[in-house]
């Protein structure tokens, strides 16, 4: 559910179930700040550009921010 | 099986407090948004108070604010509103219901869960 | 402040009959947070549809949401004796807000 990024966290619920990182378009990491004292993670999907809420404490969310962060240094020269 | 029961309801008198409690089974409960709504007698639903998985967002409904307080207790799977300086018009009966599916931002995928609700009665 | 509003207030059909609901927003309503409900005297509400149009787990084909911008309508093709009810539209608004209709009561002929 969308609040204003810079009033407050965004996340109402948060999702623990697997992402494949191929149906990922853009994977942002909000650290805590002033507004939100909590990690957030949210991912858009290629499809629809639907965006989620990932659960930062899961395996499976962590498991996929390796694979995604290995992927950007196999791109990065 | 997933499950919400409230409890802590009763017959209080004006500007006394309440505490209502709402215990969850059957689900991740820290992954889920939580939401009070209540409805007086022989009248329709009003939305209470929302919180977010974390407890990080409250929201609450303008008849309420300023004297509800919504909060939870992850490690005891438990919902809570605290209740301060209650009217007569706050008598009714309070469900605590659960959000959707409220990781998908910009989608709303409605209250999916209700528990059978506690009656609070305001009255001298 | 986006107020909901249901028409009509009570609705009597007999079994068997198609049953429209109509729920009309102050001002437009984005149909991904809409939902509907339905509610039986002595019972907890319990959700139909979700972003307008997509039914909730286990409910019956029979039963349709549509709409966009500020009218919605709830469709029951074919009463069933178990559909008669208060039926409640909701809508979510940022800040968060949450916000019900004054319900429809649909009762037997």
């Known amino acids: 559910i969308p609040l204003s990024r810079t009033v407050r966290c965004t996340c109402i619920s948060i999702s623990n179930q697997p992402v494949n990182p191929r149906s990922l378009e853009k994977l942002e990491i909000i650290p805590p700040s002033q507004f939100c004292p909590h990690v957030e993670i949210i991912a858009t999907m290629k499809k629809k550009g639907e965006k989620r809420c990932l659960n930062p404490e899961s395996k499976a969310i962590k498991n996929l921010l390796k694979a995604v962060s290995k992927e950007r240094s196999k791109r990065s020269p | 099986q997933v499950q919400l029961v409230e409890s802590g309801g009763g017959v209080v008198q004006p500007g006394r407090s309440l505490r209502l409690s709402c215990a969850a089974s059957g689900f991740t409960f820290s992954d889920y948004g939580m939401h009070w709504v209540r409805q007086a007698p022989g009248k329709g639903l009003e939305w209470v108070a929302v919180?977010?998985?974390?407890?990080?967002?409250?929201g609450y409904a303008d008849s309420v604010k300023g004297r509800f307080t919504i909060s939870r207790d992850n490690s005891k799977n438990t919902l809570y509103l605290q209740m301060n300086s209650l009217r007569a018009e706050d008598t009714a009966v309070y469900y605590c219901a659960r959000e959707g599916d409220g990781s998908n931002i910009y989608y709303y995928y409605g209250m999916d869960v209700w528990g059978q609700g506690t009656t609070v009665t305001v009255s001298s | 402040e986006i107020v909901l509003t249901q028409s009509p207030g009570t609705l009597s059909l007999s079994p068997g009959e198609r049953a429209t609901l109509s729920c009309r927003a102050s001002q437009s309503v984005s149909s991904s947070y809409l939902a509907w409900y339905q509610q039986k005297p002595g019972q907890a509400p319990r959700l139909l549809i979700y972003g307008a149009s997509s039914r909730a787990t286990g409910i019956p084909d029979r039963f349709s949401g549509s709409g966009s911008g500020t009218d919605f309508t709830l469709t029951i093709s074919r009463l069933e004796p178990e559909d008669f009810a208060v039926y409640y539209c909701q809508q979510y608004g940022s800040s968060p807000i949450f916000t019900f209709g004054p319900g429809t009561k649909v009762d037997i002929k």
């Open positions: 919180i977010s998985h974390n407890g990080a967002i409250k």
